[in-house]
């Protein structure tokens, strides 16, 4: 029960963020205009990866995408690059932990058949997780330097378009959803792998042996035990069918009774 | 089509206040930001400020912050300034506009004189 | 604040013939966001309340003729008219649409020689 609950959350916590992810790389603010100097501004300016924007007092918003590949900077790119490769990963790494989650029944799927697919999803959202929290840090990085730079009556280039010294940028609201959900999915990830452990099957059992000690007829059936797991003693009743050992709980498993997102 | 209309005339005494309305019609009230322009006999253009009448949000030129206050009410599309403690350097005319595109305004009321006289 | 200068405070141009009007800001009016200008003419005549001319420097609003042009960029701005007509006659406001407080040029009264 603990192994499906892991296995549930973690497939929860890692859609939620893989969504946050996808919705990071959309959103327009990457970079907002710093208003420390000027904080109540007639036309405010802001970028996103794809697209920078400039909204007026008057409530008229436009957008402007940047439709060129190489006028933009090497980290900009570098930054979508990271962001698409942590959203493909973390979309194969959902429908991989779909049919993987122990609560669905397909077919005659093996247990370790559905351990190997969790640990595959797991190790996916890890790294899409890693790839969003650096792709954002990437980000903040470059905005850290160009400020400065900016601030030094410089003049920086972002997104193809050249900022003067008057228009600074500080951190967007993208930027801490990417690191939210990048974190989120890291831990999606940890918690599916810490569940495929729980899902594999005991895979050396020794063969049930009869003792027959000198005036008992008992026989002791030893209950088959995992290889070098280091998770503690086995102390589940145990069924053994041809010397194979399974918990109770692993001969028939019944969907459970979760609600998914 | 977009209208702005404002009340009649008013003619006050030094010290008082005086609250101006302008009526929005033809078109979502809560859509455009409301700017007012005070305008002497003779002279030139003066922004007072701007309101946001879906949030209320407002902004000041720092010449009128403290005396006038800007408010509108969205179930009547109306949106009015007070001026307190008049001068006789505020008679005037006193126009509302609608903040479009650009941060241009596009859309002006008539006016409405204001006399300070005691 | 922002302040607008503008030259000359009055013209006088026969008509049919072209009439340039200047403006100055003490600060740039360009953002960088978008490489637009904001900068509003405007249009005043007697008894009237203004009437938008054009924004974002030399956008042209709809229904203003084709002859009333603007151009100029950063803080040096100009209004033309090509060949003014009679009802040209009016006075002309910049003003600084980029910054709190908003800010009008003293106004260029514009007759026929």
């Known amino acids: 029960m603990a192994v499906t609950a892991c296995q549930g959350l973690g497939f929860v916590v890692s859609l939620i963020g893989i969504a946050g992810i996808i919705a990071a790389t959309c959103m327009d603010q990457w970079s907002t205009q710093d208003l420390y100097n000027n904080p109540v501004t007639a036309v405010f300016n802001y970028q996103g990866l794809w697209r920078s924007c400039v909204r007026e007092s008057s409530g008229f918003t436009e957008c402007r995408g940047y439709f060129t590949l190489l006028g933009l900077p090497a980290m900009l790119q570098a930054v979508r690059a990271l962001m698409i490769v942590g959203i493909v990963l973390g979309a194969i790494g959902l429908l991989v932990s779909i049919f993987a989650l122990k609560c669905i029944r397909i077919g005659s799927m093996e247990d370790s058949a559905k351990a190997n697919m969790t640990l595959t999803s797991g190790i996916m959202f890890i790294v899409s997780g890693l790839c969003a929290i650096a792709g954002v840090s990437v980000f903040a990085n470059m905005l850290v330097t160009n400020f400065w730079m900016s601030t030094a009556n410089m003049y920086t280039g972002m997104g193809g378009m050249v900022q003067t010294v008057q228009t600074r940028y500080t951190f967007g609201a993208a930027l801490f959803v990417g690191w939210v959900a990048g974190g989120l999915t890291l831990i999606g990830g940890v918690m599916m792998c810490i569940a495929c452990r729980g899902l594999a099957p005991e895979e050396t059992n020794y063969k049930a042996v009869s003792y027959h000690a000198s005036g008992h007829s008992v026989a002791y059936k030893p209950g088959g035990f995992k290889a070098s797991t280091g998770f503690g003693s086995n102390t589940k009743n145990k069924k053994i069918y041809d010397g194979g050992a399974r918990t109770e709980d692993e001969v028939q498993s019944y969907p459970s009774k979760h609600d998914y997102v | 089509q977009v209208q702005l209309v404002q009340s009649g005339a008013e003619v006050k005494k030094p010290g008082a206040s005086v609250k101006l309305s302008c009526k929005a019609s033809?078109?979502?009230?809560?859509?455009?930001?409301i700017n007012w322009v005070k305008q002497k006999t003779g002279q030139g253009l003066e922004w007072i400020g701007e309101?946001?009448?879906?949030?209320?949000?407002?902004y000041y030129s720092e010449k009128f912050r403290g005396r006038a206050t800007l408010t509108a009410d969205k179930s009547i599309s109306t949106a009015y300034m007070e001026l307190s403690s008049l001068r006789s350097e505020d008679t005037a005319v006193y126009f509302c506009?609608?903040?479009?595109?650009?941060?241009?305004?596009?859309?002006w009321d008539q006016g409405t004189t204001v006399t300070v006289s005691s | 604040d922002i302040v607008m200068t503008q030259s000359p405070s009055s013209l006088a141009v026969s008509l049919g013939e072209m009439a340039t009007i200047n403006c100055k800001s003490s600060?740039?009016?360009?953002?960088?966001?978008?490489?637009?200008?904001?900068l509003t003419w405007y249009q005043q005549k007697p008894g009237q309340p203004p009437k938008l001319l054009i924004y974002?420097?030399?956008t042209r609003e709809s229904g203003v003729p084709d002859r009333f042009s603007g151009s100029g960029s950063g803080t040096d701005f100009t209004l033309t008219i090509s060949s003014l007509q009679a009802e040209d006659v009016a006075v002309y406001y910049c003003?600084?649409?980029?910054?709190?407080?908003?800010?009008f040029g003293q106004g260029t009264k514009l007759e026929r020689k």
């Open positions: 974002w420097a030399s």
């Open positions: 033809g078109y979502t009230f809560t859509s455009y930001v």
């Open positions: 600060q740039s009016l360009l953002n960088s966001g978008n490489q637009r200008n904001y």
């Open positions: 003003q600084n649409s980029y910054n709190y407080p908003y800010t």
């Open positions: 506009a609608i903040l479009r595109r650009g941060n241009a305004m596009d859309y």
């Open positions: 309101i946001h009448p879906r949030g209320g949000n407002t």
